[in-house]
């Protein structure tokens, strides 16, 4: 008969430069040795090879060389493919295909997703307004996959659908920015929410602009920024939004700007005599120098590290001054976690075993939650711990003991508190006696 | 009305200690970093240390690092400069001043005098 | 010796101009903020200026002005009482440290 090979039903979710685990498995026959193996992960749609084994022998990856197996567990059935930084161009369907004398296949779906960014408001014209002007005000979000939903409110929280206009599109990652327009007339005052979900993730990014129609007081230089904290992922970009108003006749010239770290004082790059005078914070900073005219004075941090997480002031002189400080939340979505079993075979309903939950390289730390297969809270004998490696990031190992009933699922979910991102894997223990893992 | 009040200072011989203070009023002491400047007598204003809103950053000028701390407490709205082991060269007026966001020392207290002397 | 460079000394008349510059570096006055204080015999030193800004309640007689790793704080129609001493003092983000002029001692002769 054929052999059976399973696969999640459900597709599997990656975010952009994470690691995702396409889970296949299959189950030996006593007696079964890996000489008799020949496994092969293709693409369903193409054929086009990416993992094989193969006379004993991991014959290695044809992907990219991103791709791997877990050798140690092939012996029990488990054909999983990792595939390590994932991009948008992998998303779609990888074929399990099995065979030792019989043969088995089965496709799992790979999607793609990546956060959209807090979106940052601009507007236009943005001084000297009053009731009855006419404003258009403009919501972008960067770097986020698939493509977005956008949704515009007001104040008062009642949909805003005319005058909407919504443009994406896809760099050379094959992730979006989007850009949403509104066009409102002005009220007496406003406040204009906008709206980024990715629907895949179901994560919603949001900013609003309150616009308050009247001439701003003069003296201090009005230095605007925003109030939320900017979210980063771990080795992307982050843009520091800072802005302020110049005056008619304004030049470059009397601009003097300077970007430090709020707690140190510690200079992070720097605008003066009208030169760009350069990062001094690892060459990872830039200014972007055609806006910067116009009193956009954002700040690009190249690659996040977990240590540039804080408070960054940016401080404008012109004539007169004007600062304000900046949060930098940074934040690594944590893997999909392994599970594993002590003792791992022979297992019989009233044995004491122990679960442990493993997901690694997150940030900040995670919240840790195990449920029974009723999805009833399991807290006690529950111990949790996480360790933080060089660059800061955390892994965390949470252990359950349980006493194994006639059969049980046993699910460990990890959670993002700032992405809002869970990451859960699960455990079935069924029959008796059994063996563990008897799937992936 | 915005206001800085030195206090603590007096004669102490070398290799002694003594604690200034300086208490705020008049303003959010704790949005503001703070230092401390000194003059001696005939001589110029010498910064000596400064430290930030929370008091988790702290910088000193090189002739009192490693003998003088200043610290903090936002509850009470005080600024303090520990001073230990005290030189003749020490001597002078110490002022306290509010340091803004600007890079600004806007407002400054009236002084206390510290005399190093056997 | 001072990180920032203050002349000694200036004089003038009553009614007269006169200008104290102060010299420094890229990581001080190059991109900081530079203030001039006015020190009065027996009295705590007193904002006078901010790069060009002058706090309410000080003159206009007083000015300022920066031009790249200089400033200069000039004082129009000299009166009697602005005999004093004037420092210049900038954060230094290289130091991490406040740096002061020597000092210029103002006489209205």
């Known amino acids: 008969g054929a052999l059976e090979v399973q696969v999640p039903e459900d597709p599997v979710v990656a975010l952009v430069g994470t690691d995702a685990t396409l889970c296949c498995s299959f189950s030996p026959e006593p007696g079964f040795s890996l000489a008799q193996l020949n496994l092969i992960w293709q693409l369903t749609d193409t054929k086009q090879l990416v993992h094989s084994f193969a006379e004993g022998q991991d014959q290695g990856s044809a992907y990219a060389n991103r791709t791997a197996l877990f050798p140690d567990l092939l012996a029990q059935g488990n054909a999983s493919l990792r595939l390590q930084r994932v991009r948008v161009a992998d998303e779609g369907s990888f074929t399990c295909f099995v065979s030792i004398r019989d043969f088995g296949s089965a496709a799992v779906s790979l999607q793609v997703a990546a956060p959209y960014s807090k979106p940052s408001m601009t507007l236009e014209p943005n001084k000297d307004l009053r009731p009855g002007d006419t404003v258009t005000i403009t919501c972008s979000s960067y770097q986020g996959y698939p493509e977005a939903e956008v949704f515009w409110q007001d104040g008062q929280g009642v949909p805003l659908t005319g005058n909407v206009t919504t443009s994406q599109m896809a760099n050379e990652q094959g992730l979006f920015d989007v850009h949403s327009i509104l066009r409102v007339v002005l009220g007496a005052n406003g406040t204009y929410s906008c709206l980024v979900r990715n629907p895949v993730l179901q994560q919603d990014a949001h900013s609003s602009v309150t616009i308050t129609p009247q001439r701003s007081p003069t003296g201090a230089v009005e230095v605007q920024v925003p109030e939320d904290p900017v979210v980063a992922l771990v080795g992307t970009d982050a843009t520091l939004r800072c802005s302020f108003s110049p005056e008619p006749g304004f030049s470059l010239a009397q601009l003097n700007l300077i970007w430090q770290l709020t707690d140190t004082k510690q200079l992070v790059h720097s605008f003066t005599e009208g030169r760009d005078q350069g990062s001094a914070y690892a060459n990872r900073t830039a200014l972007f120098p055609d806006l910067l005219a116009q009193g956009n004075a954002s700040l690009r941090l190249q690659r996040v590290r977990v240590a540039d997480e804080g408070s960054f002031t940016c401080f404008v002189s012109i004539r007169d001054f004007g600062s304000a400080a900046v949060s930098l939340q940074v934040a690594a979505p944590y893997s999909k976690p392994s599970m594993t079993l002590e003792p791992n075979k022979d297992l019989r309903p009233g044995d004491t075993v122990t679960i442990t939950c493993s997901s690694y390289r997150g940030y900040p730390e995670a919240e840790v939650f195990w449920q029974d297969g009723q999805g009833v809270p399991l807290t006690g004998n529950v111990t949790t711990s996480q360790m933080a490696n060089e660059q800061g990031l955390f892994d965390v190992h949470s252990v359950l003991r349980v006493v194994l009933g006639a059969n049980g699922t046993y699910s460990c979910l990890v959670r993002n508190p700032v992405l809002q991102q869970d990451a859960h894997g699960s455990v079935t223990i069924t029959g008796q006696p059994m063996t563990f893992p008897p799937e992936a | 009305e915005v206001q800085l009040l030195e206090s603590g200072g007096g004669l102490v011989q070398p290799g002694g200690s003594l604690r200034l203070s300086c208490a705020a009023s008049?303003?959010?002491?704790?949005?503001?970093?703070m230092s401390w400047v000194r003059q001696a007598p005939g001589k110029g204003l010498e910064w000596v240390a400064g430290i930030n809103r929370n008091g988790g950053t702290t910088y000193y000028a090189d002739s009192v690092k490693g003998r003088f701390t200043i610290s903090r407490d936002n509850s009470k709205n005080t600024l303090y400069l520990q001073m230990n082991s005290l030189r003749a060269e020490d001597t002078a007026v110490y002022y306290c001043?509010?340091?803004?966001?600007?890079?600004?020392?806007?407002?400054w207290g009236q002084g206390t005098t510290v005399t190093v002397s056997s | 010796q001072s990180v920032l460079t203050q002349p000694p000394s200036a004089s003038g008349t009553p009614g007269q101009r006169v200008t104290i510059s102060c010299s420094g570096s890229s990581s001080n006055i190059g991109r900081r903020t530079v203030n001039w204080y006015q020190q009065l015999p027996g009295t705590a030193p007193k904002l006078l200026i901010s790069n060009s800004q002058r706090p309410s309640g000080v003159p206009d007689r007083f000015s300022g002005s920066k031009s790249g790793t200089s400033a200069s704080l000039a004082i129009t129609g000299l009166q009697s009482e602005d005999e004093a001493d004037y420092y210049c003092a900038s954060w230094d983000d290289s130091l991490n440290t406040w740096v002061f002029g020597g000092g210029t001692k103002l006489t209205v002769l």
């Open positions: 001043a509010r340091w803004n966001d600007y890079d600004i020392m806007d407002v």
């Open positions: 008049g303003f959010t002491f704790s949005s503001y970093w």
